[in-house]
Amino acid sequence: APSCPQNVNISGGTFTLSHGWAPGSLLTYSCPQGLYPSPASRLCKSSGQWQTPGATRSLSKAVCKPVRCPAPVSFENGIYTPRLGSYPVGGNVSFECEDGFILRGSPVRQCRPNGMWDGETAVCDNGAGHCPNPGISLGAVRTGFRFGHGDKVRYRCSSNLVLTGSSERECQGNGVWSGTEPICRQPYSYDFPEDVAPALGTSFSHMLGATNPTQKTKESLGRKIQIQRSGHLNLYLLLDCSQSVSENDFLIFKESASLMVDRIFSFEINVSVAIITFASEPKVLMSVLNDNSRDMTEVISSLENANYKDHENGTGTNTYAALNSVYLMMNNQMRLLGMETMAWQEIRHAIILLTDGKSNMGGSPKTAVDHIREILNINQKRNDYLDIYAIGVGKLDVDWRELNELGSKKDGERHAFILQDTKALHQVFEHMLDVSKLTDTICGVGNMSANASDQERTPWHVTIKPKSQETCRGALISDQWVLTAAHCFRDGNDHSLWRVNVGDPKSQWGKEFLIEKAVISPGFDVFAKKNQGILEFYGDDIALLKLAQKVKMSTHARPICLPCTMEANLALRRPQGSTCRDHENELLNKQSVPAHFVALNGSKLNINLKMGVEWTSCAEVVSQEKTMFPNLTDVREVVTDQFLCSGTQEDESPCKGESGGAVFLERRFRFFQVGLVSWGLYNPCLGSADKNSRKRAPRSKVPPPRDFHINLFRMQPWLRQHLGDVLNFLPL
């Protein structure tokens, strides 16, 4: 077979080939940030010639051109400066309103390297209409100037810009415009992952509602669907496997879908996942009609078995057929459950389409979407029962118009995106489902995104302080109880003077709570073994504090999951009937278990909990500590099996003021407390007034650093005695 010529370099850029120089191979150009390739791609034809998709004239030299952002076409009731035909990357445009009008949105916007403006559409509004002035996004033209109930406005984009969002919006009775804000963008523009993740995540979190099935929550404002215990979500993942998708990109599609599945199952809702790969024809790898679609491991294994070569005989992009297979699945389920039944009508449906280009066969995908909307009876009342996310990857041949047509249009949300490459897609799926904004007491949720604050990452973390200086740390284990160390209270202070500082989104200093009661383990007595040469003994070093008021759950305040509880069982996605021993085996599941604690400055530090036979080698160095234990004859009397041990190799050691804080680990994007910081052989903050300054122990230190943490699996009887009516405990 002929191969295509290799004289296809792009000045200032690079290119990749999907299948080498052979016919059918797609050549994709890329340029440094702030530049875009023209043309974006070429296809090697069977004749051995390169063809540029959409090009009318013969092969032109590929070049990297500067990215530009669209200029405002009109700006009502105000002025903008500077007035240019388009704006370079880094260029600003500023908006001011005439007297009597108030500026809503961003007064200054900057052109970003992806050809998109930062900030929000600036609008000069006098608040006269039933709905707010919907504004005119940069590069758009609007017709319709009345904002009363039932009034419509229409949008189009100037010159060669592409409209995404709603081209028509109606002012609804609730004072909100229907659909989603239209944006005019350059055909070569794409979305940054850091913009897509929150946008996609917000919409998805709305749809999930992520209700904690152990309690019913009140409807919150906005589009927050509660998928109750009886409710159900069907998630359909559609993965493009056409010729233009390289095998490597397909792997990343699969990986991203796996991330999505993992995340979705970490929500405590009933979910079924369908997996469909498609090229010229769709292939259903998992149907929602299959019971296995409710089992995360089964779904992920069907994803892993998805094979790039499954579609090698038909390499077109038939998005219609892929969406139609979703429609057929819905139709079968409706017939099975009965069209009039609540079981059918209460299922919510989410479709995620991952594609790299426009459909080129099988008819318009919009037709399949119309069929889906019809079968689900999607109207204004039932709009929340369907969400279609259209995600284009690789800005080359992705059709903005088609993606926009397929994606759902909901106020304040976006459902259509184009990402630069599959790496960006992976990033988005890693960060999109942030359950940390939920208001119920779902446990063990921390915000894992890069820009989250320390408190958002560990929202259970609290500081316990007497009237004067800070002394200890602790962890919220419900909306009113804090778990901490008993030795924090050994001076028998009047607890009415103490305060517990809990994270608060409204204040970087947190919010102070009084203590209603302190329950200190009766077994704790630091001097219990003085006559055995053990000057300090920390057995039973555990305490519970009941706060005077309930903590309002937020991004900054949320309980951690306690193992051996129903709440943790749900978070671990374990079957009913699991036991406490099952949790211990799942969480402390190797000789060296990576875990974390929170430092004085709020950052998360890493340790390794030594288990099994490694525990003893971790613990036995205590016999070398002659100051705390001058006449020690039996190290087992100091380090009982109530303690977890860390501090070997590269572990961080906790400081004195970090006692009582949670020792926790992450499983399935949720956090579980397995221990609490109790005592150690080395204080890395000794002699330092600076919260951020920690000194590593010298390698030659005898004994080497070791840290001991109360093992919550060994404190079960006591925890059950005091928290039996707060948490739902599993059998031991």
Partner: antibody, heavy 122, light 108 residues
């Protein structure tokens, strides 16, 4: 409930290689907290530890048998096995598989198989 | 050395208290575990750690440890307690294990 079941030949000739398999049900050999162990008991005598295997592949053997013994784990079948080379009459015993667990300062065997008797005779 | 020593035989009158001991250097570092074995049966774990009983083991079985000696005490011995008793512990590093020679308990 965890159950262990040994299987393998009951009669061996001297110098042959003994191969025994222990099938685990109600638990997983890939669990990172257990030590899968072989123990034997010659007729009328006490218990002798042969060796233990951790699912990740680390194994410890009785120094007196180390040169002849191999323990391996097959996670796909949820089994672990014992191979003892060049057996002699001294290896005649009841062979047990057991699950070992290390907690704090103790190390114990909480579940045992029902045993298989291995006879060595020419 | 990596050895645990037990008395070969011990007897006790029905309802009385009996103590079975196990001696060895490894017991200064590790706690002993105790097993009961009846004729023709596999051993059954009766005690581990400082003094822990698995579920289903009667509370007449208890354990203690001092220096290089571990003890299993049966308070109010029953006829069904007649069996061989073995102690074991870890020694050195890793999972190296040693068993005692066993004690035959007779209930008179």
């Amino acid at each position: 409930q965890v159950q262990l079941r040994e299987s393998g030949p009951g009669l061996m000739k001297p110098s042959e290689t003994l191969s025994l398999t222990c099938t685990v049900s109600g638990g997983s050999v890939s669990s990172g907290v257990y030590y899968w162990t072989w123990i034997r008991q010659p007729p009328g005598k006490g218990l002798e530890w042969i060796g233990s295997m951790f699912y990740s592949g680390n194994a410890d053997y009785n120094p007196s048998l180390k040169s002849r013994v191999t323990i391996s784990v097959d996670t796909s079948k949820n089994q672990f096995s014992l191979r003892l080379n060049s057996v002699s009459a001294a290896d005649m015993a009841v062979y047990y598989c057991a699950r070992g667990y290390a907690s704090g300062w103790s190390y114990y065997f909480d579940y045992w198989g029902q045993a298989t008797l291995v006879t060595v005779s020419s | 050395s990596s050895e645990l020593t037990q008395d070969p035989t011990v007897s006790v009158a029905l309802g009385q208290t009996v103590r079975i001991t196990c001696q060895g250097d490894s017991l200064r570092t590790y706690y002993a575990s105790w097993y009961q074995q009846k004729p023709g049966q596999a051993p059954v774990l009766v005690l581990y750690g400082k003094n822990n009983r698995p579920s289903g083991i009667p509370d007449r079985f208890s354990g203690s440890s001092s220096g290089n000696t571990a003890s299993l005490t049966i308070t109010g011995a029953q006829a069904e307690d007649e069996a061989d008793y073995y102690c074991n512990s870890r020694y050195s590093s890793g999972t190296h294990v040693v068993f005692g020679g066993g004690t035959k308990l007779t209930v008179l």
